[in-house]
């Protein structure tokens, strides 16, 4: 419904708004103030998103997908502001929104291109598959398709397998790398160019340690300064691999400065933790403690994995008794 008086047609201008999945956004639109304001927001020029005229909303013909998700800035309309507050955007909301505003003297159309991105925090995992060792960088939900790059000892690797499953709203991506027999350090970067978000996973293999039964072992875990920021919330987990699966020995949450220890022979030095050093001690070693020990430092922006291989050998006493 637009007034039938003589009016000026103002050509369209366009802007881009980037939203994140499930967040609230504003689609901006302005016009030269005037009386008898009529506002129609449409999606892809066909679905009715929001209508306002005669001083109030008229949502009877609003497309059901927008129900209870849109509102105008009502006290700003008289100042030429027809922006739409849009709640809880989904990937299905991506596209072109057109705002038609009519007043007693003119009709204007503004186009807003809404792009929606998703970037659930990725993870870097270490897995044993039979005799092979794999590093896997994965992200459960991401959109648009991310850029994944691998480096070995800071040199880019061209081999980059990507296992991708798509759903209605986003991609789930796994990028495995076979690192069997390698002592190199590895780095995986996942970048969402739309949201300008980057996550990095870094893997470091430490030299193997040979220890005697009933001795203790100190395993280092110090974050690389390039990624680590002590102001950022992060979690540190120490785990031990036994027959292909990891069991958690202890973890630390920076937000609460809480340490949870599941193995009585495990110890953490509180003073070192305060200096962002998460090295640990395992006391009174026995033969079954042989294996791989993994330190995982994770935040929203990175995962730092450090792996130690520990070989526990029988002490001379035990050997002579046998």
């Amino acid at each position: 419904i637009f007034p039938l008086a003589f009016f000026i047609y103002v050509p369209m201008n366009e802007q881009i708004v980037i939203g994140r999945l499930d967040e609230d956004i504003i689609l901006p639109s302005s016009f030269e103030r005037g009386s008898e304001v009529v506002i129609h927001w449409k999606y892809q020029d066909s679905y009715k998103v929001h209508s306002y005229y005669k001083g109030s909303d008229h949502l009877e013909s609003q497309d059901p997908r927008y129900a209870n998700r849109t509102s105008l800035f009502y006290n700003e309309i008289q100042n030429g502001n027809a922006s739409l507050f849009f709640r809880r955007v989904s990937l299905l909301d991506e596209g072109i929104y057109t705002c038609y505003v009519g007043t007693a003297i003119q009709v204007i159309t503004n186009k807003v291109v809404l792009k929606v991105g998703v970037f659930l925090t990725p993870v870097m995992k270490y897995e044993k598959r039979n005799t092979n060792s794999f590093l896997i960088c994965s992200v459960l939900s991401v959109y648009p398709r991310p850029i994944i790059t691998w480096k070995m000892d800071n040199t880019p690797i061209s081999e980059n397998n990507m296992e991708e499953t798509g759903s209605l709203d986003s991609f789930s991506i796994n990028s495995p790398l076979n690192i069997t027999g390698s002592n190199s350090s590895y780095e995986c970067t996942i970048e969402n160019s739309l949201l300008k978000q980057t996550w990095t996973g870094r893997w470091t293999m430490k030299d193997g340690l040979h220890k005697m039964q009933s001795e203790h072992v100190s395993l280092s875990c110090q974050p690389v300064n390039d990624y680590f920021s002590p102001n950022q919330d992060f979690k540190v987990t120490w785990s031990r691999m036994k027959s292909g699966t990891f069991s958690v020995l202890a973890y630390y949450l920076s937000s609460s400065q809480n340490t949870i220890i599941n193995e009585s022979r495990f110890s953490w030095n509180k003073e070192l933790i305060n200096q962002s050093d998460f090295s640990m001690n395992l006391m009174d070693l026995n033969l079954s403690d042989s294996g791989e020990y993994l330190c995982n430092i994770s935040s929203d922006e990175y995962t730092l994995l450090t792996i130690h291989t520990v070989h526990v050998e029988p002490s001379q006493e035990t050997a002579s008794h046998n």
């Epitope: 802007q15 708004v17 980037i18 994140r20 499930d22 967040e23 609230d24 956004i25 504003i26 901006p28 639109s29 302005s30 129900a67 209870n68 509102s71 105008l72 800035f73 009502y74 006290n75 700003e76 502001n81 922006s83 507050f85 709640r87 809880r88 949201l195 300008k196 978000q197 950022q232």
Partner: antibody, heavy 116, light 107 residues
Framework: EVMLVESGGGLVKPGGSLKLSCAVS????????MSWVRQTPEKRLEWVAT????????YYPDSVKGRFIISRDNAKNTLYLQMNSLRSEDTAMYYC?????????WGQGTTLTVSS | DIVMTQSHKFMSTSVGDRVSITCKAS??????VAWYQQKPGQSPKVLIY???TRHTGVPDRFTGSGSGTDFTLTISSVQAEDLALYYC?????????FGGGTKLEIK
């Protein structure tokens, strides 16, 4: 970590002006609408202003419209609130907030006292 | 303007108890309601948005419910650190408005 750090509060006489700043880090500032919310000495919260991600559109409640101006510098990751014609009822703690999932990140606040 | 009313200014509870903080909107706001927690000396933090969705990192003892005009924030087992002011807020229609707050006190 997302950090919002407000500054610029102080003691101002009625009718005076003051400009608050909020330095933002840890998020893609230019992608988000940003807001100011204030808390009165009686602990009531009140939405004060919002600015669109690009900075071209601003929104205010009637209580501050025409007196307060919200602006942003996306190159400097900084949000501003210019407050003019201040009144005693503007005395409050002013918080800079991100508009994402409701007001989902808040700064530590800066205090404005309007008194003669 | 939509008025958000938190009828209890204060609520007293014991550690381990279940407590429900209520909020009433002066008109239908669908599920466009958020809940905030403000601990002494700190800024508010969002706990719940869209009436029932928990914000990242919020313990699962906090639950939001309701739609239309009546909303509830429930803490299933109150902890000492839950001593705080709790606010509801609607973003259904501008101006966005907050409730007056409910102060949770631990006996």
């Amino acid at each position: 970590e997302v950090m919002l750090v407000e500054s610029g509060g102080g003691l101002v006489k009625p009718g005076g002006s003051l400009k608050l700043s909020c330095a933002v880090s840890g998020l893609t500032f230019s992608s988000y609408a940003m807001s100011w919310v204030r808390q009165t000495p009686e602990k009531r919260l009140e939405w004060v202003a919002t600015i669109s991600s690009g900075g071209s559109h601003t929104y205010y409640p009637d209580s501050v419209k025409g007196r307060f101006i919200i602006s942003r510098d996306n190159a400097k990751n900084t949000l501003y609130l210019q407050m003019n014609s201040l009144r005693s009822e503007d005395t409050a703690m002013y918080y800079c907030t991100r508009l994402g999932r409701a007001f989902d990140y808040w700064g530590q606040g800066t205090t404005l006292t309007v008194s003669s | 303007d939509i008025v958000m009313t938190q009828s209890h200014k204060f609520m007293s509870t014991s550690v381990g108890d279940r407590v429900s903080i209520t909020c009433k909107a002066s008109q239908d706001v669908s599920t466009a309601v958020a809940w905030y927690q403000q601990k002494p000396g700190q800024s508010p933090k969002v706990l719940i948005y869209w009436a029932s969705t928990r914000h990242t990192g919020v313990p699962d003892r906090f639950t939001g419910s309701g739609s239309g005009t009546d909303f509830t924030l429930t803490i299933s087992s109150v902890q000492a650190e839950d001593l705080a002011l709790y606010y509801c807020q609607q973003d259904y229609s501008t101006p966005w408005t907050f409730g007056g707050g409910t102060k949770l006190e631990i006996k």
